[in-house]
Amino acid sequence: EINGSANYEMFIFHNGGVQILCKYPDIVQQFKMQLLKGGQILCDLTKTKGSGNTVSIKSLKFCHSQLSNNSVSFFLYNLDHSHANYYFCNLSIFDPPPFKVTLTGGYLHIYESQLCCQLK
C-alpha cells in the first residue's frame, strides 16, 4: 500500500528487543527511510549512489539498523511499556523517479513476555 498498514509482519521480538522491519520495492535504488514513533522521527537511513555507482549510507538520527536489498530493519532494545505506540516506516524514493513518499505502519503491543530483563 502507498499509505496504510504494513501487509507483512513489521515487528519481530527477540532478547528483550524488537526488530522493526521497513520494506521497500526491489526496484528502489536511492531512498531515505525514517522510523517514526507517533509523529516523532526516531531513526533514519539514507542510501544514495554516487559516480561509478558507489553506494553511500548515511544516518542523521542513528539507530542500530540493517540494510538489505528490499528492507531496512531498525532495532530497539530494552523494551518497556513506554515503547507501546504506533510506528511508521516513512519511505522517500529518489531513484527511480519520480520522487515518491510512502507511509506504512502498525501498533507495537508490549506484553510482559517481551520485556527486557524480567525477574524470573
Epitope: E1, I2, P25, I27, S92, I93, F94, P96, P97, P98, F99, K100, V101
Partner: antibody
Framework: QVQLLESGGGLVKPGGSLRLSCAAS????????MNWIRQAPGKRLEWVSY????????YYVDSVRGRFTVSRDNAKNSLYLQMNSLRAEDTAVYYC???????????????WGQGTTVTVSS | DIQMTQSPSTLSASVGDRVTITCRAS??????LAWYQQKPGKAPKLLIY???SLEGGVPSRFSGSGSGTEFTLTISSLQPDDFATYYC????????FGQGTKVEIK
C-alpha cells in the same frame, strides 16, 4: 491561478537546435519537481525529462540523452529545455508539467502548459 | 521499461452510459497510476492519481480502481463534456503512458 506557459517552438532543420521555455505562475515553483512531456502527431504521450525542485537531480528518456539538456531558474520561475542535434522523430508538441512536491511526493502531473510545437524537417 | 496497454482503443458510447476503460501494466506498479483526459489541441488534464484518488475539481462520476498490474477508469454516467481521449500513466519507475482510449459519440 496556477499556470504554465511554454514558448520557443518552431520549425528547424535536422541537426539544428531550439530552446524551449516554460514560465510558471500562481505557485511556489521552487517547491516542485518538473517534467517535459511530448506528443508526436497521432501518438501517445512520451516523457522526455525530469528535474528536481533544486535542479540537482535530472533524468532523460534514452532517446534524447546527450542531445537535450533540462535546466531551471527558480528566481525567474522558469524551466528550460535546450534541444540540440534535432531529428525528424523529435517532431511533437512539447508540454511542461508539474510533478512531485518536495515534501509530499508525486501525485501525478497535476498542472500542464498548453504546449509548444516543434517541427524538425528539411 | 514498463509498458502500459489500454483497452479498448476506441469506445463508442452515449450520454448517460457507464463507461469502463482498462489499463494493464507489464509488471506490478503497486498503485502508482494516474489517469488523464485529453481533448483535441489541448493539454492533458489529471483526473485520478495513486490509482483511485480523485484530483481536486474533477467530477465524482470519475473513479479509478485497481493495483498491481490491472487498473480501471470508470465514468458512471457519461456527460457531453466527457467525449475525449483518456490515457493511463504509470509512475512507479520513470513514466510511461498507455496508447490512449478515445471515447466517441455512438
Amino acid at each position: 491561478q496556477v499556470q504554465l506557459l511554454e514558448s520557443g517552438g518552431g520549425l528547424v532543420k535536422p541537426g539544428g537546435s531550439l530552446r524551449l521555455s516554460c514560465a510558471a505562475s500562481g505557485f511556489t515553483f521552487s517547491d516542485y519537481y518538473m517534467n517535459w512531456i511530448r506528443q508526436a502527431p497521432g501518438k501517445r504521450l512520451e516523457w522526455v525529462s525530469y528535474i528536481s525542485n533544486s535542479g540537482t537531480t535530472i533524468y532523460y528518456v534514452d532517446s534524447v540523452r546527450g542531445r537535450f539538456t533540462v535546466s531551471r531558474d527558480n528566481a525567474k520561475n522558469s524551466l528550460y529545455l535546450q534541444m540540440n542535434s534535432l531529428r525528424a522523430e523529435d517532431t511533437a508538441v512539447y508540454y511542461c508539467a508539474r510533478d512531485a512536491h518536495y515534501v509530499s511526493g508525486s501525485e501525478g502531473m497535476d498542472v500542464w502548459g498548453q504546449g509548444t510545437t516543434v517541427t524538425v524537417s528539411s | 521499461d514498463i509498458q502500459m496497454t489500454q483497452s479498448p482503443s476506441t469506445l463508442s458510447a452515449s450520454v448517460g452510459d457507464r463507461v469502463t476503460i482498462t489499463c494493464r501494466a507489464s509488471q506490478s506498479i503497486s498503485s502508482w497510476l494516474a489517469w488523464y483526459q485529453q481533448k483535441p489541441g489541448k493539454a492533458p488534464k489529471l483526473l485520478i492519481y495513486k490509482a483511485s484518488s480523485l484530483e481536486g475539481g474533477v467530477p465524482s462520476r470519475f473513479s479509478g480502481s485497481g493495483s498491481g498490474t490491472e487498473f480501471t477508469l470508470t465514468i458512471s454516467s457519461l456527460q457531453p463534456d466527457d467525449f475525449a481521449t483518456y490515457y493511463c500513466q504509470q509512475y512507479y519507475s520513470y513514466w510511461t503512458f498507455g496508447q490512449g482510449t478515445k471515447v466517441e459519440i455512438k
